[in-house]
């Protein structure tokens, strides 16, 4: 007869490990007992369990409550056992010794491998601002056994660097993603992808990029100068900019206070029916936590009774 087992049994942390040991005997042969022991190199054998043809299953005190026989039906030549709720410390070499009649004793060894799936974490880097050089966008760390693979999935152009730390029974892998921040990256996903044999599918953690910037400011509303004449209703100036975080707007008049009746509504300056009092230099001030911008325009309200044309100067400053 001969023993059938596996060279390696692989389980995920917390699962039950079936340790196979089957005696393929000739007809008339009987198995008296199957003794299981842990036999790691450099350490004495530690008894696990005994499957006895008459006495049944005995579990050694160190494994009490953790070793069982597979559920029925059972073949009397099958000496396999279940090790419940595998932990990392269970990883190692195991031996089954089968005592048969009349053929004598046989033994076989297997290695139990316990996979520890990683629990990845993603940590964003410092605040990203347009104009910075190469900057850390995020780092992703995953620890497991064996060492997990950490990669990045993104449309954003950048560079990655990885390092790993080996522990006694696991390894931690950290990957960093660096980029040169630009406003086009704002709102783009940056996804850390962790692969491991103990995972049914890759684990993904997504970080949305936020790049602080503030665009140049400009003012719209004076495109048709002839519309700015005395008595006109509904005239308005709109300040144009964009930024992250979204900017706030403030309107002032360079040559004095805002005329009465002029309404400030965020980025828009609304005028009552125009009079010559509304002529002047208006400044739009745009700011966010990152920067600030100014744009100024000169409004010249025309008197239709005058023949002279209106002149408008547009000046932008930052």
């Amino acid at each position: 007869g001969e023993l059938e087992t596996s060279d390696v049994v692989t389980v995920v942390l917390g699962q039950d490990a079936k340790l196979p040991c089957f005696y393929r005997g000739d007809s008339g042969e009987q198995v008296g007992q199957v003794a299981w022991a842990r036999v790691d190199a450099g350490e004495g054998a530690q008894e696990l369990a005994l499957l006895h043809s008459k006495y049944g299953l005995h579990v050694s005190p160190a494994y009490e409550g953790r070793v069982e026989q597979p559920p029925p039906p059972r073949n009397p030549l099958d000496g396999s056992v279940l090790l419940r709720n595998a932990v990392q410390a269970d990883e190692g070499e195991y031996e089954c010794r089968v005592s048969t009649f009349p053929a004598g004793s046989f033994q076989a060894r297997l290695r139990l491998r316990v996979l520890v799936p990683p629990l990845p974490s993603l940590n964003p880097g410092p605040a990203l601002e347009e104009g910075q050089g190469l900057t850390l966008a995020a780092s992703c760390t995953a620890e497991g056994s064996p060492a997990p693979s950490v990669t990045w999935d993104t449309e954003v152009k950048g560079t990655t660097s990885s390092r790993s730390f080996k522990h006694s029974r696991s390894a931690a892998v950290t990957s960093e993603f660096h980029l040169v921040p630009s406003r086009s990256m704002n709102g783009q996903p940056l996804t850390c992808v962790v692969s491991h044999p103990g995972l049914l599918q890759d684990q993904r953690i997504t970080h949305i990029l936020h790049v602080s910037f503030l665009a140049e400011a400009s003012v719209r509303g004076l495109e048709d100068q002839n519309l700015w004449h005395i008595g006109r209703e509904g005239a308005m100036l709109k300040c144009l900019s964009e930024g992250q975080p979204p900017p706030s707007y403030n309107w002032t008049r360079l040559d004095g206070p805002l005329p009465s009746g002029v309404r400030v509504d965020g980025d828009t300056l609304g005028f009552p029916p125009l009079t010559t009092e509304h002529s002047g230099i208006y400044v739009c001030h745009v700011s966010n936590e990152f920067s600030s911008r100014d744009s100024q325009v000169t409004v010249d309200v025309l008197d239709p009774q005058e023949d002279s044309g209106k002149q408008v100067d547009l000046v932008s400053a930052s």
Partner: antibody
């Protein structure tokens, strides 16, 4: 025919010592695990100590741990029990017994006692 | 330690009676259980091992059953020589422990 013959019992004062012997014959002594079991007058059976074939696995009842020592000499086919610091509650008939040999090379398990000696009386009294 | 509880502690029966003695373990012991017979002034004698296996030379009127925690010794037809004290013993853990005994007396 399997025979186990105990000797060495007797009267001893509290705190004293005795050494019990058990001479085995009729079987290959070195192939079997052995045990000592005692029975106080009018009481039930109490397992005292056991020793595996090669002396590798030795166990004691908590009541005698640190005071009694089991040993064997396979060349003389003899089992021993050295009893020190004896107490009145150690008074009993001490039996030497052979363990049934149907479990091999597994020290965590002891087996049934298939042959017993006639016993030797140990009396601890002042 | 595993506690072994026998019942009854004593019983009176007549020759030819069917006698049943039970033994309960404080935790599961598979079939690591033996039954012994002891007569006054004599050493115990192994009757049953592995809960239900008859020791060589023991009459077939003795039988054992059970596994886990509950076990039974049955004498199918009591004979005069069967009047004695009977002990169960677990050997699943060290120390092996005995029940307190059941004395079978003549009615």
């Amino acid at each position: 025919e399997v025979q186990l013959v105990e000797s060495g019992g007797g009267l001893v004062q509290p705190g004293g010592s005795l050494r019990l012997s058990c001479a085995a014959s009729g079987f290959i002594f070195s192939d079997f695990d052995m045990s000592w079991v005692r029975q106080a007058p009018g009481k039930g059976l109490e397992w005292v100590s056991g020793i595996k074939q090669s002396s590798a696995g030795i166990n004691y009842a908590d009541s005698v741990k640190g005071r009694f020592t089991i040993s064997r000499d396979n060349s003389k086919n003899t089992l021993y029990l050295q009893m020190n610091s004896l107490r009145a509650e150690d008074t009993a008939v001490y039996y030497c017994a052979r363990e049934y040999s149907d479990v091999v090379d597994y020290v965590s398990v002891r087996t049934p006692l298939d042959y017993w000696g006639q016993g030797t009386l140990v009396t601890v009294s002042s | 330690d595993i506690q072994m509880t026998q019942s009854p502690s004593s019983l009176s029966a007549s020759v030819g009676d069917r006698v049943t003695i039970t033994c309960r373990a404080s935790q599961g012991i598979s079939s690591y259980l033996a039954w012994y017979q002891q007569k006054p002034g004599k050493a115990p004698k192994l009757l049953i091992y592995a809960a239900s296996s008859l020791q060589s030379g023991v009459p077939s009127r003795f039988s054992g059953s059970g596994s886990g925690t509950d076990f039974t010794l049955t004498i199918s037809s009591l004979q005069p020589e069967d009047f004695a004290t009977y002990y169960c013993q677990q050997h699943y853990t060290t120390p092996p422990t005995f029940g307190q005994g059941t004395k079978v007396e003549i009615k």
